[in-house]
Interface confidence: low
């Protein structure tokens, strides 16, 4: 429970705070969990403890592991764990998901991107900022204290932003980089109660025993960006994945955005080798979003042979 993930890049500074809270006056002891070896407090060491902080100056891949911190007060001890992973520097521009900090959003009127974890470091302005590995240039970008301000935000400004700064420890400088996604609020569009285009309510679908059958659940949710737009199939009120019949599977169809701007989704139910018992099941096409859930029910019936006319 009192565990925190921290990560960094080799040859950069990494400072980790003990996940357990305590007053500044409390003593904090740090240990490397795998060996139970105490982390030194002397600053001449590359890895050393400084109260609530554990400092890697600089970090090495071999430093990865779980570190234990014990906050000691006159009346109690509290234990926390810092799960530290140090990664090799990427040769290409892509920042993998595991190096990303939390996503922040902005709009035309408010577009601050804070540099993650910077408050743990001893740094001086200005920060350097990069978007998708390119240094940011132009009057629209303003590095201000620990955050970046983007003027006149556009949807094209969405992307991965990296801040780079120097941590100073006893006169020695160490580089630190941190990356987070920036998303742009879309102020266009609307959502409405889901409209199921197919199948029709209480539709009877004719199938042939022994053959394959496909049912498509298709619904539209509004214009532009949509909240939790989802379509799915249920069998007798149970999710396909929980129903446990390997012959019956659903797969996502095309996510459609029509020329009229409507955002629609398809989910295809595939039934292999249709059996008699499949005719007894109730097939529900569900479409849901913020406004609620709409359900259309389908039943299967045996296809009459063409020559059956007497």
């Amino acid at each position: 429970k009192f565990s925190k993930q921290s990560w960094g890049l080799e040859n950069e500074a990494l400072i980790v705070r003990c996940p357990r809270q305590g007053k500044p006056s409390y003593t904090v002891d740090w240990y490397y969990s795998q060996t139970n070896k105490s982390i030194p407090t002397q600053e001449r060491n590359r890895v050393f403890a400084s109260g609530q902080l554990l400092k890697f100056l600089p970090a090495a891949v071999a430093d990865s592991g779980i570190y234990t911190c014990i906050v000691r007060s006159p009346t109690f001890n509290r234990t926390g764990y810092a799960n530290v992973t140090i990664y090799k520097k990427q040769s290409d521009c892509n920042v993998p998901d595991y190096l990303m900090y939390s996503t922040v959003s902005g709009s035309e009127k408010n577009s601050k991107i804070y540099c993650p974890t910077i408050d743990l470091y001893n740094w001086t302005a200005p920060l350097e900022w990069f978007k998708n590995c390119q240094a940011l240039q132009g009057s629209r970008y303003r590095a201000h204290k620990s955050f970046l301000v983007i003027d006149n935000v556009m949807t094209e400004d969405a992307g991965d932003y990296t801040c780079k700064f120097i941590h100073n420890e006893n006169g020695a400088n160490y580089s630190v980089t941190a990356t987070r996604s920036f998303t742009v609020k879309d102020e266009q569009g609307f959502s409405l109660f889901p409209v199921i285009g197919a199948p029709a309510q209480n539709e009877i679908k004719e199938v042939e025993i022994g053959k394959n059958a496909n049912l498509t659940c298709s619904a539209c949710f509004g214009k532009g960006t949509q909240f939790l737009a989802a379509v799915l199939w249920q069998l007798n009120g149970t999710k396909i994945t929980d129903f446990g019949e390997p012959r019956i599977q659903q797969e996502e169809g095309q996510n459609q955005s029509f020329s009229n701007g409507l955002a629609c989704l398809d989910m295809v139910l595939r039934i292999a080798d249709v059996k008699e018992e499949d005719l007894l099941l109730q097939y529900d096409c569900l479409a849901l979003n913020l406004h609620g859930l709409r359900r259309h029910t389908v039943r299967l019936s045996r296809k009459n042979p063409i020559d059956h006319h007497s």
């Epitope: 609307f190 409405l192 960006t225 949509q226 939790l228 989802a230």
Partner: antibody, heavy 132, light 107 residues
Framework: QVQLVQSGAEVKKPGASVKVSCKAS????????VSWVRQAPGQGLEWMGG????????TYAQKFQGRVTMTRDTSTSTVYMELSSLRSEDTAVYYC?????????????????????????WGKGTTVTVSS | DIQMTQSPSSLSASVGDRVTITCRAS??????LNWYQQKPGKAPKLLIY???SLQSGVPSRFSGSGSGTDFTLTISSLQPEDFATYYC?????????FGQGTKLEIK
């Protein structure tokens, strides 16, 4: 920045109805969902339902179904929440809240495309007291 | 309906402390979780959306994590203005539901 201005406090007798208004000032909320959330004295938050002001489509929590009606007047950028058959336990502060839509990385979610809903602008609340 | 359970219900802490509040959903809600702060007599204020995304204008000492059923809100260094009640809210399915709240008080 849109602000939500709510109507004033109301005192009602059991069995009566109350209609609370929520007006968008400094903009419109025609592109957003508006939720109604209530909070009884000393209690937590309870979502009652929501309306899409541009379409008038509504969705209500089961608990309030049949007693609550949410409407809108697009000409004045106002939404309304009417609660009928009031009882003493309906005494609460009623908030309207604007829902925002933001594009987020699809990888963050396992269900549906990467769109997200939250309530980012709230009215100051309207106190409704039901007492005989 | 999805039930949201917060713990602890109340919490005493001091300025400068690091505080963690947890929220558990009765079923998986992916990352569809928001956190709000509410002060007495005021409307709630959005802090975190999508489990870990910081709302514009919210100080960076607030952070959120988790997915599925277990989520946490962390305040890295408590400030005097942070003493309030905090609510989690699931946005995974209709109807929207809130946790019962965690009251953060001065020790």
């Amino acid at each position: 920045q849109v602000q939500l201005v709510q109507s004033g406090a109301e005192v009602k007798k059991p069995g009566a109805s109350v209609k609370v208004s929520c007006k968008a000032s400094g903009g419109t909320f025609s592109n957003y969902g508006v939720s109604w959330v209530r909070q009884a004295p000393g209690q937590g938050l309870e979502w009652m339902g929501g309306i899409n002001p541009s379409r008038g489509t509504t969705t209500y929590a089961q608990k309030f179904q049949g007693r609550v009606t949410m409407t809108r007047d697009t000409s004045t950028s106002t939404v309304y929440m009417e609660l009928s058959s009031l009882r003493s336990e309906d005494t609460a502060v009623y908030y309207c809240a604007k829902g925002d839509i933001v594009v987020v990385p699809a990888a963050m979610f396992s269900l549906g495309p990467g769109y997200y809903y939250y309530m980012d602008v709230w009215g100051k609340g309207t106190t409704v007291t039901v007492s005989s | 309906d999805i039930q949201m359970t917060q713990s602890p219900s109340s919490l005493s802490a001091s300025v400068g402390d690091r505080v963690t509040i947890t929220c558990r959903a009765s079923q998986s809600i992916s990352s569809y979780l928001n956190w709000y702060q509410q002060k007495p007599g005021k409307a709630p204020k959005l802090l975190i959306y999508a489990a870990s995304s910081l709302q514009s204008g919210v100080p960076s000492r607030f952070s959120g994590s988790g997915s599925g059923t277990d989520f946490t809100l962390t305040i890295s260094s408590l400030q005097p203005e942070d003493f309030a009640t905090y609510y989690c809210q699931q946005a995974n399915s209709f109807p929207i539901t809130f946790g019962q709240g965690t009251k953060l008080e001065i020790k």
